[in-house]
């Protein structure tokens, strides 16, 4: 079943997805699509990378992390109720049927009307712990269960500060993660 992530109307949603390049610079294409991962590719593609750059995107969708080091987590700007649904992160590993597919469920809640006294973070999410095993074939990923909700509205750091903090490492460890090689 899909892992669930939540955001409020008007905020930015964050859908984590990571992989570990086999070697520095050995990037693989990644696609993000709206809807569950099909057999091949991504349906309703919203963003795509190649071996070097983001080469396709639609408005409001971007990769805020260091995608050249495997952080291909998707940010959706200023979400509406229509953004609810399943999203597919597909790591397009060369070879037949080698792709790694992750279905992430985004639930959009109506915005709270209470005034915010401090700067608000963009998302509230429950991050599953993922275990990556290294083997000769495609990486296997097991979900070990969910952590309690991490309410990031309580953290008044900016996104770039977050990325450099220990919490960022926790997020990296707890998103959809695979190791290639």
């Amino acid at each position: 079943s899909e892992v669930e992530y939540r955001a409020e109307v008007g905020q930015n949603a964050y859908l984590p997805c990571f992989y570990t390049p086999a070697a520095p610079g050995n990037l693989v294409p990644v696609c993000w699509g709206k809807g569950a991962c099909p057999v091949f590719e991504c349906g309703n593609v919203v963003l795509r990378t190649d071996e070097r750059d983001v080469n396709y995107w639609t408005s409001r969708y971007w990769l805020n992390g260091d995608f050249r080091k495997g952080d291909v987590s998707l940010t959706i700007e200023n979400v509406t109720l229509a953004d609810s649904g399943i999203y597919c992160c597909r790591i397009q590993i060369p070879g037949i049927m080698n792709d790694e597919k992750f279905n992430l469920k985004l639930v959009i809640k109506p915005a709270k009307v209470t005034p915010a006294p401090t700067r608000q973070r963009d998302f509230t999410a429950a991050f599953p712990r993922m275990l990556t095993t290294r083997g000769h074939g495609p990486a296997e990923t097991q979900t070990l269960g969910s952590l309690p909700d991490i309410n990031l509205t309580q953290i008044s750091t900016l996104a770039n500060e977050l990325r450099d903090s220990r919490l960022a490492n926790d997020l990296r460890d707890s998103g959809a993660t695979i190791r290639i090689g």
Epitope: V54, W57, W62, L63, F67, T75
Partner: antibody, heavy 120, light 107 residues
Framework: QVQLVQSGAEVKKPGASVKVSCKAS????????MDWVRQAPGQGLEWLGY????????SYNQKFKGRVTMTTDKSTSTAYMELRSLRSDDTAVYYC?????????????WGQGTTVTVSS | DIVMTQSQKFMSTSVGDRVSITCKAS??????VAWYQQKPGQSPKLLIY???NRYTGVPDRFTGSGSGTDFTLTISNMQSEDLADYFC?????????FGGGTKLEIK
């Protein structure tokens, strides 16, 4: 040391083609991308595309798609950029530049530039 | 395509000044911005990549900052040899795009 040496200046008529060469030395040619950038007189920089000599993979700026072709000759560590159907607004200095993963595919070494003048 | 805007085409400075050159992206590019210096008749030179990483051999008076859509190149102690054009570049998406440039001049 890393060097990128480009071919000499060219004067072309509208509708013609130009092929600029860029000979690399001082590093492993197939380990880096070769980007091409141009600069019209008194203007900013414009990216045309790149080629990855390792596998011949290319990515072109859509603005030039159909008019530009990038190739390499691994035996001589030389990259080529051909631009066809030249127009007067293609008059510019054309640069080759090396890019690699270590610098997030930014361009750390540049050729000296090749001036292409398109005039009838 | 992502548009990179350097709103100041020219900046007047004096030796010893602290100079800040700004660049704005039309959409978020994370940290994927580079800065180049170009002197008249020369090829561009890489100064900063991935927003804040100083390229090898670049003096530490050059500092890059910013993320998302707003980026700044700061020269902490302006030297006469720093008089040049400065271009920002987003290296997030294809096609890569550059700002229009900012020319530093002496007051």
């Amino acid at each position: 040391q890393v060097q990128l040496v480009q071919s000499g200046a060219e004067v072309k008529k509208p509708g013609a083609s130009v092929k600029v060469s860029c000979k690399a030395s001082g590093y492993t040619f197939t380990d880096y991308y070769m980007d091409w950038v141009r600069q019209a007189p008194g203007q900013g920089l414009e990216w045309l595309g790149y080629i990855y000599p390792n596998n011949g993979g290319t990515s072109y700026n859509q603005k030039f798609k159909g008019r530009v072709t990038m190739t390499t000759d691994k035996s001589t560590s030389t990259a080529y950029m051909e631009l066809r159907s030249l127009r007067s607004d293609d008059t510019a200095v054309y640069y080759c530049a090396r890019s690699g993963y270590g610098n997030y595919y930014t361009m750390d070494y540049w050729g000296q530039g090749t001036t292409v003048t398109v005039s009838s | 395509d992502i548009v990179m805007t350097q709103s100041q085409k020219f900046m007047s400075t004096s030796v010893g000044d602290r100079v800040s050159i700004t660049c704005k992206a039309s959409q978020s590019v994370g940290n994927n911005v580079a800065w180049y210096q170009q002197k008249p008749g020369q090829s561009p030179k890489l100064l900063i990549y991935y927003a804040s990483n100083r390229y090898t051999g670049v003096p530490d008076r050059f500092t890059g900052s910013g993320s998302g859509t707003d980026f700044t190149l700061t020269i902490s102690n302006m030297q006469s040899e720093d008089l040049a054009d400065y271009f920002c570049q987003q290296h997030y998406s294809s096609p890569s795009t550059f700002g229009g440039g900012t020319k530093l001049e002496i007051k």
